[in-house]
Interface confidence: medium
Amino acid sequence: FPQDRPFEDTCHGNPSHYYDKAVRRCCYRCPMGLFPTQQCPQRPTDCRKQCEPDYYLDEADRCTACVTCSRDDLVEKTPCAWNSSRVCECRPGMFCSTSAVNSCARCFFHSVCPAGMIVKFPGTAQKNTVCEPASPGVSPACASPENCKEPSSGTIPQAKPTPVSPATSSASTMPVRGGTRLAQEAASKLTRAPDSPSSVGRPSSDPGLSPTQPCPEGSGDCRKQCEPDYYLDEAGRCTACVSCSRDDLVEKTPCAWNSSRTCECRPGMICATSATNSCARCVPYPICAAETVTKPQDMAEKDTTFEAPPLGTQPDCNPTPENGEAPASTSPTQSLLVDSQASKTLPIPTSAPVALSSTGKPVLDAG
C-alpha cells in the first residue's frame, strides 16, 4: 500500500518508534525493562513495568503479591491484574464479618430467619440476611417456605445456619492457608444438624438484641447479642469462644450464643494437658513406619516433575482405621480428597499430614 509509505517513513531514523505492519501505524518503542500496555503504544505512558504472575504493579510502582482466595470460605471476585490485586469475597451462602484489604478475614454463614420472622433483605457476600417480623397471613417477602415455617409446638425457634452443600466449594477454593482445621471446621458447619445453635447463624433484625423467641412488642424477653465468635457467659458478658485454630485441634461443638466453642484433639492424637473447653497439649498416639509417597506422573504442559506434591511431609502412621485410604463411610473431617489442576497442587500447612490416593491426588489424612 503506497499510501502507507509516508507513515512508515516517519518511523525510520526515529529510534524511539517502530512501524507495526499489522496495525499500519508508527508505534512508540518501550524502553528496556518496560512492557507495552497495548499492541501499538503511542506514548511513554503506554509502557509499564511487568510483574511476575500473581503480582500486580502497585501505586508505588512496585510488584506486590495479589491476595490469595485459597481459604475454603472465599471465592475469587476479580482476578489478579497487572495493576490491581485479586479480590476475594465470601463464597455463596456466606457474608463477611471482618473485612480485609481486597478480601475478607472472617466469613460466616447467612442467618436463616427464625420462626415468626421473614427475609427482608437476602444475605450477600458483604451483608448478613436481614429479617423482619412476619405480617399476618403469608407475606410475599417469604423467600422460601423454610423462612416462613411456624415452629412445632414446644420448640424454641433459633436462627440456624443456612445448609450449604459441600459441593459448592470448588477445587480452586479448597483450604490452603487454613489446611486441616479449615476443612474440618467447614465440614462441621456443613454437617451440623440444622437446628443446632450456631455462632454463624444469627438474625440481624436488631443489631443489639436477638430474641430467644420472636420478641413480642413491649416484652422484655430479648437477650443481648454478642459479636461473632463470642458467647454470653453466666455474668451476661460477651466472652470470646475458644479457638480451635491450632493444627492439632478440631471443633467438637460450635460457638453458640450461650456457650463457648469446645475443641478436642484431632483424630490420631490424645489430650495430654487439658484446658477449659479445649486441650492445651495434644500428643500423637504411638506410631509406626509410614509408606513411601510415590511421585505423581507428569500430567500437563507445565512441568510437574518435582519430587512430591507440596503437602508437608508424609507422616508416621498410627495403626488406626483413619490412616491411609479412608473407608467409604469416613466423614469429611477425616479425609478430604483435594481435586486440583494437574499442574497445580494444593498446599497443606506444616502440621497437616497427608497421604496420596491411588489417583495421585493428595488426601488429607487425619491419622
Epitope: 525493562g33 512492557f35 511487568q50 510483574c51 511476575e52 504472575p53 500473581d54 503480582y55 502497585d58 512496585r62 510488584c63 506486590t64 503479591a65 491476595v67 490469595t68 485459597s70 480452586s172 490452603v176 492457608r177 504442559e301 507445565k302 512441568d303 510437574t304 516433575t305 518435582f306 507440596p310 486440583s340 489442576q341 499442574s343 497445580k344 497442587t345 494444593l346 498446599p347 500447612p349 506444616t350
Partner: antibody, heavy 123, light 106 residues
C-alpha cells in the same frame, strides 16, 4: 527432575566484565522466569533480578541496575548474567534460581537453585 | 524496600533440643514468607513457604508460623544434620529481600 547447572568459578580484574551461565533442564525453559541472587560473606542474600526466557523481559533490583545484564537463549535453555565494571565488592557467589509451581498461586519463593558461581575480583 | 530482620545471628544447641529463629518484616507481608536452610558449601534449600507450609521432603521437625510482620521457624528435636545457616525471605513485594541469616551450631 528440575536442574539448574551453573558455569564454573571466575577470576577477574577490577573494571573487567564476566558472563556466567545457568543451564536449565527437566522442565520447559520458557515457562518459568530465572532469578539471580548474590551471596557475599557477611551480607544478606541479595535478589538481583530475573529474566523471562519466553519474552526476554527482565526486571532488576534497583541496586543492580547498570551493574548486571540478564539474557536468555531459548535454543540452549540457558540464562546468562553479565557483571560489568567489576570491583572487589562484586566478589561473591551468584546463584540462579527458579520458583516452584505449587498451589494455585505463583509466588516467588525459590524451590530450585543452581550450585552457584563464585566470582573473585582481584588485581 | 522491605527489610527482614532475623535473630539471633548465631545459635548454639545440642541434639534433641528445640530452637526458634525469628524474622521481623519492616512492613506487613501477609504470609508471603519462605524459610531456607543452607549447609556449608551448598545452595539454599527451601524448608517452609507461605509462612507455615512445609515443602515436600522436609522433615516435620521444621515448622513455620506467623503472619503480618512476625515470623518464626522452629526446629524441634534438633539433629546433627541440621547444622546450617537459616534464612527467611519475603516475596510479598519486589525487590525480594532476605533476612541476615542464623547460623546454627551443634
Amino acid at each position: 527432575q528440575v536442574q539448574l547447572q551453573q558455569s564454573g568459578a571466575e577470576l577477574a580484574r577490577p573494571g573487567a566484565s564476566v558472563k556466567m551461565s545457568c543451564k536449565a533442564s527437566g522442565y520447559t525453559f520458557t515457562t518459568y522466569t530465572i532469578h539471580w541472587v548474590r551471596q557475599r560473606p557477611g551480607h544478606d542474600l541479595e535478589w538481583i533480578g530475573y529474566i523471562n526466557p519466553s519474552s526476554g523481559y527482565s526486571d532488576y533490583n534497583q541496586n543492580f541496575k547498570g551493574k548486571t545484564t540478564l539474557t536468555a537463549d531459548k535454543s540452549s535453555n540457558t540464562a546468562y548474567m553479565q557483571l560489568n565494571s567489576l570491583t572487589s565488592e562484586d566478589s561473591a557467589v551468584y546463584y540462579c534460581a527458579r520458583r516452584a509451581d505449587y498451589g494455585n498461586y505463583e509466588y516467588t519463593w525459590f524451590a530450585y537453585w543452581g550450585q552457584g558461581t563464585t566470582v573473585t575480583v582481584s588485581s | 524496600d522491605i527489610v527482614m530482620t532475623q535473630s539471633p545471628k548465631f545459635m548454639s544447641t545440642s541434639v534433641g533440643d528445640r530452637v526458634t529463629v525469628t524474622c521481623k518484616a519492616s512492613q506487613n507481608v501477609g504470609t508471603n514468607v519462605a524459610w531456607f536452610q543452607q549447609k556449608p558449601g551448598q545452595s539454599p534449600k527451601v524448608l517452609i513457604y507461605s509462612a507455615s507450609y512445609r515443602y515436600s521432603g522436609v522433615p516435620d521437625r521444621f515448622t513455620g508460623s506467623g503472619s503480618g510482620t512476625d515470623f518464626t521457624l522452629t526446629i524441634s528435636n534438633v539433629q546433627s544434620e541440621d547444622l546450617a545457616e537459616y534464612f527467611c525471605q519475603q516475596y510479598h513485594t519486589y525487590p525480594l529481600t532476605f533476612g541476615g541469616g542464623t547460623k546454627l551450631e551443634i
